[in-house]
């Protein structure tokens, strides 16, 4: 049996930040689970991990240099990514593994979310063009 | 039996244009086929069509307002997209149907290609700041 995951097909990060909500066909209450977000068509980069345990506080971390936070709902995990670069525009996949209580469950691969990082393209002020050569 | 399709996982369109090559596990020589490119995780937008017929010239067209051209190889079709907008950053899927000779064949869904349209972000020249209020 597999958990189904729903994600928004596309999100635009105008200010280099985005909330990506992963919705599961499974209630995570009182479960020990590992929810993760993966970048790229090959899911090669593990962007962020949310580790949930019935007895402990939620653990959120990234081992790949992303600035991320996570929030838990009964049937969802929301990843909040900040300080994204324009070149981090890509497809991002939600993944979930429920370890305890058994049996182990994971998800059918989701369709993913295209995160388009538009960022802020700052132009120098025309009144203050910056230092010039004498 | 299904045709397998290979695409580059990601392409960046710096100048609002990109070449997307769809490579097939099938030789299109002397076949009647319809190769198409689809935008979005749901493949909802048919971006461009290349119709090949052993007796006629290649037909390339878009019914969705994209500026596209196509080039045929023995086992590939390359779509050349121009005048892309930044907000057309998305995932693009190659599709192929071989109509003749029988049997009809189409492809296993490919992984797709993220096309990141960076465009040109022009800043006004600091020497010519443009009109100002009197």
């Amino acid at each position: 049996n597999k958990i189904l995951v729903k994600q928004s097909p596309m999100l635009v990060a105008y200010d280099n930040a985005v909330n990506l909500s992963c919705k599961y066909s499974y209630n995570l209450f009182s479960r020990e689970f590992r929810a993760s977000l993966h970048k790229g068509l090959d899911s090669a980069v593990e962007v962020c991990v949310v580790y949930g345990n019935y007895s402990q506080q939620l653990q959120v971390y990234s081992k790949t240099g992303f600035n991320c936070d996570g929030k838990l709902g009964n049937e969802s995990v929301t990843f909040y990514l900040q300080n994204l670069y324009v070149n981090q525009t890509d497809i991002y996949f939600c993944k979930i593994e429920v370890m305890y209580p058994p049996p182990y469950l994971d998800n059918e691969k989701s369709n993913g979310t295209i995160i388009h990082v538009k960022g802020k393209h700052l132009c120098p002020s025309p009144l203050f063009p910056g230092p010039s050569k004498p | 039996n299904k045709i397998l399709v290979k695409q580059s996982p990601m392409l960046v369109a710096y100048d609002n244009a990109v070449n997307l090559s769809c490579k097939y596990s099938y030789n299109l020589f002397s076949r009647e086929f319809r190769a198409s490119l689809h935008k979005g995780l749901d493949s909802a937008v048919e971006v461009c069509v290349v119709y090949g017929n052993y007796s006629q010239q290649l037909q390339v067209y878009s019914k969705t307002g994209f500026n596209c051209d196509g080039k045929l190889g023995n086992e590939s079709v390359t779509f050349y997209l121009q005048n892309l907008y930044v907000n057309q950053t998305d995932i693009y899927f190659c599709k192929i149907e071989v109509m003749y000779p029988p049997p009809y064949l189409d492809n296993e869904k490919s992984n797709g290609t993220i096309i990141h349209v960076k465009g040109k972000h022009l800043c006004p020249s600091p020497l010519f700041p443009g009109p100002s209020k009197p």
Epitope: E32, Y54, E97, M99, Y100, P101, P102, P103, Y104, D106 | -
Partner: antibody, heavy 120, light 111 residues
Framework: EVQLVESGGGLVQPGGSLRLSCAAS??????????VSWIRQAPGKGLEWIGE???????YYSPSLKSRVTISRDNSKNTLYLQLNSLRAEDTAVYYC????????????WGQGTLVTVSS | DIQLTQSPSSLSASVGDRVTITCRAS??????????LHWYQQKPGKAPKLLIY???SLQSGVPSRFSGSGSGTDFTLTISSLQPEDFATYYC?????????FGQGTKVEIK
């Protein structure tokens, strides 16, 4: 036939590190449905679970050892590894790897064990 | 962590005796009607061997004189007629929550 063979045990200095291997055959470490745990047994004592790795590569560790332990694997060699740092005398034990299936998580196959002695 | 307490810690018995070992969990190890409690046998210098899984299911190849029962927090391993090769140490183990834990063991010795 499923087999697990541990290696890498021996005498280690206090404060040192150990890296044990567990070569699996008869099943793939990266195929869904099975995972592998490391378990240890101090001389004359009971069994202590160290941690586990799932087919996905996700790992879980005993809270009491988490800061010192790393479980990893090499899919190409179908081999599992246990790295334990900052060793002390109480880490002296026979170290076992054991396979479990995802439904009940019972350990249905065990290796023969490898003895690690921490002493100066 | 879930604590498992076995009793007795050791016992002396004769060949042919009926032997019962109990395992008590500090909280229920049941989920959706399944008890995630297993029993192992270990002989000196050897790795443990799975006897019973999910409280009462006999592992393939294990003699039918071994049986398990119980649910929730209280479990029992029974050897209906003790054989010479059954003299060993027996452990219960829970897999309901991590960290997985074992009982302290029950040593079955020859009287």
């Amino acid at each position: 036939e499923v087999q697990l063979v541990e290696s890498g045990g021996g005498l280690v200095q206090p404060g040192g590190s150990l890296r044990l291997s567990c070569a699996a055959s008869g099943f793939s470490l990266s195929t869904g449905g099975v995972g592998v745990s490391w378990i240890r047994q101090a001389p004359g004592k009971g069994l202590e679970w160290i941690g586990e790795i799932y087919h996905s590569g996700s790992t879980y560790y005993s809270p009491s050892l988490k800061s010192r332990v790393t479980i990893s694997r090499d899919n190409s060699k179908n081999t599992l590894y246990l790295q334990l740092n900052s060793l002390r005398a109480e880490d002296t034990a026979v170290y076992y790897c054991a396979r479990y299936e995802y439904y009940y998580y019972d350990f249905d196959y065990w290796g023969q064990g490898t003895l690690v002695t921490v002493s100066s | 962590d879930i604590q498992l307490t076995q009793s007795p810690s050791s016992l002396s018995a004769s060949v042919g005796d009926r032997v019962t070992i109990t395992c008590r969990a500090s909280q229920s190890v049941d989920f959706h009607g399944i008890s995630f409690l297993h029993w192992y046998q270990q002989k000196p210098g050897k790795a443990p061997k799975l006897l019973i899984y999910a409280a009462s299911s006999l592992q393939s190849g294990v003699p039918s004189r071994f049986s398990g029962s119980g649910s929730g927090t209280d479990f029992t391993l029974t050897i209906s007629s003790l054989q010479p090769e059954d003299f060993a140490t027996y452990y219960c183990q829970q897999s309901y929550r991590s960290p997985r834990t074992f009982g302290q063991g029950t040593k079955v010795e020859i009287k």
